[in-house]
């Protein structure tokens, strides 16, 4: 019997999307590249449920993790990597006192209970996101794909 695997091996399924939590570290820009290389995007958060799921994943592992949010284009104007603005309702997720832009901190990370802005050059873990396969048409969607890990080889 063929099984439906909506996500590649080592990816996590949640509400119609697949998420990859890296085990290595890259700066924010290289994290974007790593996600693109596997047909995904540095995570853009669309709902409170998704935010809670991702925050939990990050805090459980006690890792500081890049998301696809920055104010690099215009200081103080936070924008997702897909070009959408940060909605006012999402500003509650910043940790107390954040974002503070201390020392030009222009990229957002999952930091414990909430979000923090930090220097984009710093190497951190990252989360990629892509749509899950529907498992309705293509033969390949019924097969577990080969591992798709955007991690570089260990140093």
């Amino acid at each position: 019997e063929r099984l439906c695997h909506p996500c590649p091996w080592e990816w996590t399924f949640f509400q119609g999307n697949c998420y990859f939590m890296s085990n290595s570290q890259r700066n924010w820009h290289d994290s974007i590249t790593a996600c693109k290389e596997v047909g995904a995007q540095l995570v853009v958060i669309k709902s409170a449920e998704e935010q809670n799921f991702l925050q939990l994943q990050s805090s459980r592992s006690n890792r500081f993790t890049w998301m696809g949010l920055s104010d690099l284009n215009q200081e103080g104007t936070w924008q997702w990597v897909d070009g959408s603005p940060l909605l006012p309702s999402f500003k509650q997720y910043w940790n107390r006192g954040e974002p503070n832009n201390v020392g030009e901190e222009d990229c957002a990370e999952f930091s414990g209970n909430g979000w923090n802005d930090d220097k984009c050059n710093l190497a951190k873990f990252w989360i990629c996101k892509k749509s899950a396969a529907s498992c309705s048409r293509d033969e390949e969607q019924f097969l577990s794909p080969a591992p798709a890990t955007p991690n570089p080889p260990p140093a």
Partner: antibody, heavy 120, light 112 residues
Amino acid sequence: QVQLVQSGAEVKKPGASVKVSCKASGYTFTGYYINWVRQAPGQGLEWMGWINPNSGDTNYAQKFQGRVTMTRDPSISTAYMELSRLRSDDTAVYYCARENSGYGKLFDYWGQGTLVTVSS
Amino acid sequence: DIVMTQSPLSLPGTPGEPASISCRSSQSLLHSNGYNYLDWYLQKPGQSPQFLIYLGSNRASGVPDRFSGSGSGTDFTLKISRVEAEDVGVYYCMQALQTPYTFGQGTKLEIK
């Protein structure tokens, strides 16, 4: 594998300056702060400051302000710590350490240390 | 500056027995993100320091599970469930909440 290799031992006279190097390998040099920590003979650890190898931004402990200068050369993945107006109580082993911000501010790799002796 | 105080400063350890080190900070190390910015390091004789625990209670990769960290705010503890001969050295706590980062005086673990 990640390595921080420091320059060799130095003997200096009071009032002179010393410059210690820390060559990084096995990782992206610009992605992690380099901290400098010293240890006087038989004593504990003392934080001196950090440098962001990407931007060159620094943060020095007040105690060393005006005497310490931290620099870097990304082209050779090397950080430097220069301490001027040396005194006998600056005799210590000086360590560089990589700060891993993926785990908070953990110093996950340390150099082997450079002994600086200040003696007339 | 945040002052870090360790006790005891000297700790005789018996192989196979537990050991415990206390670290107190002059102000809370609890960040608004919920993490305590307190790390533990071990400096073995003649070596550079090495990491053990980060963010108060998280064992770093490759650290034996006999080491554990606990505590929050201003009071922290490093426990070794069963001391081994290779655990000898000086243990330091370090606060990384704010600069200047500061270390405890160190606790020297020796085997009885």
